[in-house]
């Protein structure tokens, strides 16, 4: 009955602080109504990174202000988290929730450890 | 800090009505889905009926499909439950929950009291 | 419907005493949906465990889960006498979201 939801271990984010992963699930049934959810780990602590609820076949819609982008296709979500800096450096979990049709699934990742080093700052130039 | 205040409880007689309230507070309501969840004088836990983030989707427990209704205004960060053609089985506490991050319910109200008797 | 069963039913011990509770599922539950929860009379419960063995906010180590598959375990290694309450498991990876009957954990 549980969800499998797979993702990557190990991410590294860009020097420009975007960090690109795959998070698939294992649909127990024919959802056609999905909400994924991005939670950041951090010393037992969850938080919300972003969110997006989509219809299958439709594209993923994040909120205007989220630092999250997405794809869709099937049963694979490809997210993009941008205006990541080293502080942001953690273990990123990706959560879908099957809504629609009953039953109800829900499907927890075991997290992606995203490492995102700042870039060395541009030496002056005389 | 996280509470959840449960209200609109009380005695009815069988077939007569009821709505239930929970306020919610030191949370962002409309990004956590919710629970109604009873528990019968000396009874273990029963969960009720589930609610989605913005409303849309819900589930109810077959002993009370179709007859119980669950609801949210975001607005107010308000979760209700409209509870229709009582039963005495139907008398218990009831409780509101929110569902944590990774499923769970991580926090209750402290419950109301239903009683439907004659 | 996954239906969740607890033994004992009722387990008496001493403080000090180490508690070992049961819940076995009718399917396979993923360990990362499997929660235990502590309820004291007059009281709501209160989460203690989720996703089979981490512990919730502000719960004492005495406290450990473990199990997978069908057969969960809730472990409290030295009864204070504030442990002494109901405890139920919980399974939310599918609906309807169901609570195993519970175990009492009383006074010897």
């Known amino acids: 009955k549980a969800m499998h939801v797979a993702q990557p271990a190990v991410v590294l984010a860009s020097s420009r602080g975007i960090a690109s992963f795959v998070c698939e699930y294992a649909s127990p049934g024919k959802a056609t109504e999905v909400r994924v959810t991005v939670l950041r780990q951090a010393d037992s602590q969850v938080t919300e990174v972003c969110a997006a609820t989509y219809m299958m076949g439709n594209e993923l819609t994040f909120l205007d202000d989220s630092i999250c982008t997405g794809t869709s296709s099937g049963n694979q979500v490809n997210l993009t988290i941008q205006g990541l800096r080293a502080m942001d450096t953690g273990l990123y979990i990706c959560k879908v929730e099957l809504m629609y049709p009953p039953p109800y699934y829900l499907g927890i990742g075991n997290g992606t450890q995203i490492y995102v080093i700042d870039p060395e700052p541009c030496p002056d130039s005389d | 800090q996280v509470q959840l205040v449960e209200s609109g409880g009380g005695v009815v007689q069988p077939g007569r009505s009821l709505r239930l309230s929970c306020a919610a507070s030191g949370f962002t309501f409309s990004h956590y889905t919710m629970h109604w969840v009873r528990q019968a004088p000396g009874k273990g836990l029963e969960w009720v009926t589930f609610i989605s983030y913005d409303g849309n989707n819900k589930y109810y427990a077959d002993s009370v499909k179709g007859r119980f209704t669950i609801s949210r205004d975001n607005s107010k960060n308000t979760l209700y439950l409209q509870m229709n053609s009582l039963r005495a089985e139907d008398t218990a506490i009831y409780y509101c929950?929110?569902?944590?991050?990774?499923?769970?319910?991580?926090?209750w109200g402290q419950g109301t009291l239903v009683t439907v008797s004659s | 419907e996954i239906v969740l069963t607890q033994s004992p039913g009722t387990l008496s011990l001493s403080p000090g005493e180490r508690a070992t509770l049961s819940c076995r599922a009718s399917q396979s539950v993923g360990s990362s949906y499997l929660a235990w929860y502590q309820q004291k009379p007059g009281q709501a419960p209160r989460l203690l465990i989720y996703?089979?063995?981490s512990r919730a906010t502000g719960i004492p180590d005495r406290f450990s889960g473990s199990g997978s598959g069908t057969d969960f375990t809730l472990t409290i290694s030295r009864l204070e006498p504030e442990d002494f309450a109901v405890y139920y498991c919980?399974?939310?990876?599918?609906?309807?979201?169901?609570f195993g009957q519970g175990t009492k954990v009383e006074i010897k």
């Open positions: 919980q399974q939310y990876g599918s609906s309807p979201w169901t």
């Open positions: 929950a929110r569902t944590g991050w990774l499923g769970p319910f991580d926090y």
């Open positions: 996703g089979a063995f």
